[in-house]
């Protein structure tokens, strides 16, 4: 029961996390124009991983994609790569974890297989979450560096008159979505790994003991026979094949929700 809940919750948390990573990757507001202590402009600039946008005071918004690949900063390319790797790993992890869920019956899949799949998906979620956190953190570091560089340039003018006011950029909503989503995916992955330990059949329970019954003798090897008559069978593991809908084992799905600012 606790294992099923842990596994189910881990799956849901990871699902929300991966949805968040996808949303963050697609969002345009990775960096937004800093409005504090800046000459107030009638346009608002913000940038994403794939395009930059300008919103005029009328609400008119124009976005331009980064149509060059070689001309983009290496750091931006690295962030893109980290986010995509995170999404791909997360998606594979979700696919694997669906089949690994204890509450879902797929043929005569053994518990050991489910345990391995749960561990695999858990590791994938952990790596996915780390990729997202790393990607967002690299971008944030890039912003901080550029922010202070542009601040320094802002107050140094030629001949006492600044001809151009540099637009400074600060953290956008996508960064926070990415951090939270990466964290959730990481937590979900850890939960899956914890659930895996509970799923794994404990071999120490079944020693090689010879039972002398009247009439005939049956030797039980470690792990027991799955196709036995029921005597001494692993009822703990067998409960999964009941097929009946049991409310305590059902995984409640929480809707994925994230605000696009």
């Amino acid at each position: 029961m606790a294992v099923t809940a842990c596994q189910g919750l881990g799956f849901v948390v990871s699902l929300i996390g991966i949805a968040g990573i996808i949303a963050a990757t697609c969002m345009d507001q990775w960096s937004t124009q800093d409005l504090y202590n800046n000459p107030v402009t009638a346009v608002f600039n913000y940038q994403g991983l794939w395009r930059s946008c300008v919103r005029e005071s009328s609400g008119f918004t124009e976005c331009r994609g980064y149509f060059t690949l070689l001309g983009l900063p290496a750091m931006l390319q690295a962030v893109r790569a980290l986010m995509i790797v995170g999404i791909v790993l997360g998606a594979i992890g979700l696919l694997v974890s669906i089949f690994a869920l204890k509450c879902i019956r797929i043929g005569s899949m053994e518990d050991s297989a489910k345990a391995n799949m749960t561990l695999t998906s858990g590791i994938m979620f952990i790596v996915s979450g780390l990729c997202a956190i790393a990607g967002v953190s690299v971008f944030a570091n890039m912003l901080v560096t550029n922010f202070w560089m542009s601040t320094a340039n802002m107050y140094t003018g030629m001949g006492g008159m600044v001809q151009t006011v540099q637009t400074r950029y600060t953290f956008g909503a996508a960064l926070f979505v990415g951090w939270v989503a990466g964290g959730l995916t990481l937590i979900g992955g850890v939960m899956m790994c914890i659930a895996c330990r509970g799923l794994a059949p404990e071999e120490t329970n079944y020693k090689a003991v010879s039972y002398h019954a009247s009439g005939h003798s049956v030797a039980y090897k470690p792990g027991g026979f799955k196709a036995s008559t029921g005597f001494g069978s692993n009822t703990k593991n067998k409960k999964i094949y009941d097929g009946g809908a049991r409310t305590e084992d059902e995984v409640q799905s929480y809707p994925s929700k994230h605000d696009y600012v």
Partner: antibody
Framework: QVQLKQSGPELVRPGASVKLSCKTS????????IHWVKQRSGQGLEWVVR????????YYNEKFTGKATLTADKSSSTAYMQLSSLKYEDSAVYFC?????????????WGQGTSVTVSS | DIVMTQSPSSLTVTAGEKVTMNCKSS????????????LTWYQQKPGQPPKLLFY???TRESGVPDRFTGSGSGTDFTLTISSVQAEDLAVYHC?????????FGGGTKLEMK
């Protein structure tokens, strides 16, 4: 077609207040910024303030903070600008205008102007 | 505030002549993100409100004759009339549409000989 009709000329005493109106038609009033621009006789234009009727948000030229107060009546699609504590230098023609959508923050339609004369 | 300086303050021309007027801003009006200059040109005839001619420095408003051309970038902008007509006699204003508060130039008055 888009139209902005302003109230008639005003002759006021120094220290008094005046409320100018700008009635709009031909477009959705709540979706566009309304600006007010001052033009003193034979001089250039001076941006005073703008209001977004949909939300009531306003941006003032600091020079006119405390001098001008903006309001908008959605039901009649009319913008108002009240000028208080009038001085002789407030004598000017005041234009209301609409900020165009996707036109680089420019004002695409203008009212005919309201002449305000401050005289004792 | 951004200072907009227009030159000359007045121009006396003859019909059919090519006219150029300038507008200089104290700070760049170029937004690097979209490479657009937030400068607007207006035409104001006597007793009338201003009329929008150009936005983004060079984008002609609908209904404006193509003899009018807006150009320039950063801090220096130009309005050119290729062949002046009698109906073009007016005051031409440039406006900073990038920084608050919006500011206007002193205007260039176009007169006929």
């Amino acid at each position: 077609q888009v139209q902005l009709k302003q109230s008639g000329p005003e002759l006021v005493r120094p220290g008094a207040s005046v409320k100018l109106s700008c009635k709009t038609s031909g477009y959705i009033f709540t979706n566009y910024w309304i600006h007010w621009v001052k033009q003193r006789s034979g001089q250039g234009l001076e941006w005073v303030v703008r209001i977004y009727p949909g939300t009531g948000n306003t941006y003032y030229n600091e020079k006119f903070t405390g001098k001008a107060t903006l309001t908008a009546d959605k039901s009649s699609s009319t913008a108002y600008m009240q000028l208080s504590s009038l001085k002789y230098e407030d004598s000017a023609v005041y234009f209301c205008s609409r900020e165009g959508y996707g036109k680089g923050n420019s004002m695409d339609y203008w009212g005919q102007g309201t002449s305000v004369t401050v005289s004792s | 505030d951004i200072v907009m300086t227009q030159s000359p303050s007045s121009l006396t021309v003859t019909a059919g002549e090519k006219v150029t007027m300038n507008c200089k801003s104290s700070q760049s009006l170029l937004n690097s993100a979209n490479q657009k200059n937030y400068l607007t040109w207006y035409q104001q005839k006597p007793g009338q409100p201003p009329k929008l001619l150009f936005y983004w420095a060079s984008t002609r408003e609908s209904g404006v004759p193509d003899r009018f051309t807006g150009s320039g970038s950063g801090t220096d902008f130009t309005l050119t009339i290729s062949s002046v007509q009698a109906e073009d006699l007016a005051v031409y204003h440039c406006q900073n549409a990038y920084y608050y508060p919006y500011t206007f130039g002193g205007g260039t008055k176009l007169e006929m000989k």
